[in-house]
Structures are given as C-alpha cells and as structure tokens.
C-alpha cells in the first residue's frame, strides 16, 4: 500500500450566494487526520494518533494552507454559472501518494453536488472529465475560471504536487505512521436468529494497516462467500480499522465453527462461545 495524503474540501452556496464557511478534512494513509469545520478554520488533529504524528508543532501552517484552499474553492464556486436556487456544494479532493518504489502520484478531483465533473493529474497536468453534458459544461466553466486566475499557472500545479508530497514526507518522518503494524483485537459473539439457528459474528478492531482476512470456517474449511456477510473495513477514529463477518449456523453445531483472521503475516482462529457465554475476546 502506498503512503497517501488526501485533502477533501467542501464549500456550499445557497440561493446563488457562496457561504462563508467551509469543511476541510485531511486523511493520512486513509485515516482521518486533520479537520476544519468552522467559519474560522482551526486545524484540529483527529485523535491521539494525529497528535502523535504532528508532535508538539502548532498547526498554524496547516490552518493557513487549508484556509487558503477554502478561499480559492469558494471563489471557484462563485463562478459556476448554472447555480439554481437551493443548496449546492463544490468539493475538491486532492491526493498525493508515495509508493514503495519511491514513485509518486498526485491528482485533484472536483465534484459539484456530489457528482465528479473534472479531474487533473497534477504531475502531467492532464485534465479529464466524464462524458455527461452537465459534467462537460461544469468542467469548461471551472477550467476557464482557473485559467483566468493568475495563480493557476503551470508552476501552481507543480507547487500543489510538491507541497502535498512535502507535507506527506514531513508527517511520515514522525515515524508514527511509517510501516507500523497494530494487530487486531478479535471477538466472537452469538445471537439468536430463527428457531434452531444462531447468528455468529466475528469482529476485528484496532488493527493497522487495513488489509485483513476475516472469514468463517466449518471443520477447518472456509465457508462459501454466499453464506457469509461482511462489513466494510472502516476507520475507528483511533488511526486503526475495524470490520466484521457473520454467518448463520444451526444451534448445537457451534463447536464446528471458527473465525479465521489473518493480518500482516499473522493469523489466529477463534471459536464460537458456547451456551450463555456471549463474548470471547482474544488478542494474538
């Protein structure tokens, strides 16, 4: 998995006029990291993990950058011609990545009312847009505005690319993020389903990175996909992830079933608690 820094900025307009506030979210390696959600932006670390990455530094620099980006985006929204009455949103997502071979990728994407209408590869400066006529109209509109803006020159896009990577490298230097591995906590619960059946759920939480195998086995053999239900792998707000898998089994057959977990080269198996015991928790 490459290391990544992702900026997500959203500005709103109501009945033709752009609202003054904006929302900015920054994700580091897919984890919520920084957030600004006030009229006056003050970059706030998202959890202890983000504070550990940022160290004792103040977040003036992040605050300044995000405020500037928010201001730019508000100006862009003001130039979108087809604003009908009601609430509208313009969202800019900028991502940069550093891959294991040290190659880099950077891009930015614009969304109007949640719909993608314009993307740019910040390294090649190549623009792409979806085929729909609405997207094309919006894209032309925004590109024309960006061209007019003296700031949006070739050097500006290179700077955006370079700045993003520079910030990412700065955060990675903290060592908190760099190739860390946090093993999951796994617990298995059971609940009554229909008569004679129970639902067994296996939850893994607090793990990093996000890649994990979690599945049910019967007599040591993996159950087919269609007999299992998986939850998404989601950030849990602590710089780690959580997920779950569930299946329905016949009451009395619990001993035949185990939850199998594999993460970062380690694995474990977890039996179904019997009878009245509701939770069996273990850390490998």
């Amino acid at each position: 998995e490459p290391h990544s820094l992702r900026y997500n900025l959203t500005v709103l307009s109501g009945d033709g006029s752009v609202q003054s506030g904006f929302l900015a979210e920054v994700h580091l390696d897919g984890q919520p990291f920084l957030r600004c959600d006030r009229q006056k932006c003050r970059a706030k670390p998202q959890g202890q993990w983000a504070e550990d990455v940022l160290g004792n530094k103040t977040w003036d620099r992040e605050t300044r950058d995000l405020t500037g980006n928010g201001k730019d985006l508000r100006m862009t929204l003001a130039h979108i011609k087809d604003q009908k009455e009601g609430l509208h949103s313009l969202q800019e997502i900028r991502v940069c990545e550093i891959h294991e071979d040290n190659s880099t990728r950077s891009s930015q994407h614009f969304y109007y009312d949640g719909e993608l209408f314009l993307s740019q590869n910040l390294e090649t400066e190549e623009w792409t847009m979806p085929q729909s006529s609405r997207a094309q109209t919006l894209a032309m509109n925004v590109r024309n505005f960006l061209k007019e803006d003296a700031m949006k020159t070739k050097t500006h896009y290179h700077a955006m690319h370079a700045d993003c990577l520079q910030e990412l490298r700065r955060y990675l230097k903290s060592g908190v993020v760099l190739r860390r591995t946090v093993p999951p906590m796994v617990n298995v619960t059971r609940s009554e389903a229909s008569e004679g059946n129970i639902t067994v759920t296996c939850r893994a939480s607090g793990f990093y990175p996000w890649n994990i195998t979690l599945s049910w086995r019967q007599d040591g053999v993996s159950l087919s996909h269609d007999t299992q239900q998986w939850g998404d792998v989601l950030p849990d707000g602590n710089g780690t992830y959580q997920t779950w898998v569930a299946t329905r089994i016949c009451q009395g057959e619990e001993q035949r079933f185990t939850c199998y977990m594999e993460h970062s080269g380690n694995h474990s198996t977890h039996p179904v608690p019997s009878g009245k015991v509701l939770v069996l928790q273990s850390h490998w």
Epitope: R217, D219, G220, V221, S222, Q255, R256, T258, Y260, H267, S268, T269, H270, P271
Partner: antibody, heavy 118, light 107 residues
C-alpha cells in the same frame, strides 16, 4: 510443498497406550486443522477427530472419545494422537491429514501401523 | 451417523476405458462429497472435493458429479497409475463418514 511425516510402526501389548506423531512442514502449522483417520486391516476409513493447532480446540467422533486424545506442539509443528487401553480392535493404520482451507483431508501423512498383540 | 454405500467393492477395466464409481449417502449431504484415491502402498490422495471440484494437480481425466444422495466419480481414460482403491466421504454432518471403497483393477 505440504508434507505430513508420521512416526514409525508400533507393536504394543493389550492394555498399554501409544502416541502417534505427525510432523507438518511446507506451510504455517497453526493455520489449518489436523485430522486423524483410522483404517483397520482391509477395511474402510473412520474419522477419529480433529484439532485446531492454533488454540488446541478439538472435535471428536463420539466413538473415539475416551480412546483418542489429540494434542499439538506448536514449537515443533507436530500433532499427536494418544491411544489408551489398547485392544486388538485398535490394531490399524492411523493417518493424519490436513486441509488447504477449501477441502477436508487435502493432504495425508503416510500412515502409522499400530499392532496390538500379546 | 450417515452411511456411505459404495455398492461395487471391486471393478475390472481395461486401459483407456471410461470408468464410473458410484456412492450413495443414507441422507441428503448437500454436495459435501469428496473422493480419495488410496494406492496399494497405502498412500492416500484427495481427488475431488465438493462433488465436482478437482483438487490441484489431479489429472483432468478425473471428474465428479451428483447431488442429494447419489454421487459418482468418473475416470475418462483409464491409465495404469489409476490402479487403486477409491473412497467417497461426506463432510456435511459429524461424524464424517467414508464409503467402504471400490478397488479398481486392470483386466
């Protein structure tokens, strides 16, 4: 390559006990169950039970409860089956097997002949 | 316990023949049926799992079919190395049970 190497033949007296070993190699031992199967001379196969090497959990055929005890030694990637109070009925070839996670008894050991005779 | 019946205990066929070995379960086993080959020296190998899935490395002349209680193993083009005893086994219900085996010989 997955391999299960079983201990050599055993000649034991009635009433005694025996421990058959099954050393696994070519895969992560604690990832997959070890199954045990009995084949009496010229007869079919009978499933004895299985053990999860990760946590030592076992599931056994009722018929062999009290007769066979399944254990593992994770440090040597070896599974054991202890057979007690042996009688002539226990004379058989005993196989260990493991799975690839997709099918039962995917890979088999070469078998261990246990002969109970006075 | 579920009884697995292989009615043919031994079978004689010529090299190149198509051979079918059948197996019947005493109740529906929902396709949880595996086939194993045991060579005269005692070596056991998995051939087919879940009725029709060929285990890796097994020649494609082996195939399996069936459903409910009736299952079969087919060898499409018998070769000398196929001389062995073939066992079916159900994995649906504990205890796992095996058929009594079908010994395949060359005419």
């Amino acid at each position: 390559e997955v391999q299960l190497q079983q201990s050599g033949p055993e000649l034991v007296k009635p009433g005694a006990s025996v421990k058959v070993s099954c050393k696994a190699s070519g895969y992560a031992f604690t990832k997959y169950n070890i199954y045990w199967v009995k084949q009496s001379h010229g007869k079919s196969l009978e499933w004895i039970g299985y053990i999860d090497p990760y946590n030592g959990g076992t599931v056994q055929n009722q018929k062999f409860k009290g007769k066979a005890t399944l254990t593992v030694d994770k440090s040597s990637s070896t599974a054991y089956m202890h057979l007690n109070s042996l009688t002539s009925e226990d004379s058989a070839v005993y196989y260990c097997a493991t799975t690839d996670g997709y099918s039962l008894f995917t890979y088999w050991g070469q078998g261990t002949l246990v002969t109970v005779s006075s | 316990d579920i009884q697995m019946t292989q009615t043919t205990s031994s079978l004689s066929a010529s090299l190149g023949d198509r051979v079918t070995i059948s197996c019947r379960a005493s109740q529906d086993i929902g396709n949880y049926l595996n086939w194993y080959q045991q060579k005269p020296d005692g070596t056991v190998k998995l051939l087919i799992y879940y009725t029709s899935r060929l285990h890796s490395g097994v020649p494609s002349r082996f195939s399996g079919s069936g459903s409910g209680t009736d299952y079969s193993l087919t060898i499409s083009n018998l070769e000398q190395e196929d001389i062995a005893t073939y066992f079916c086994q159900q994995g649906n219900t504990l205890p796992f049970t095996f058929g009594s085996g079908t010994k395949l010989e060359i005419k």
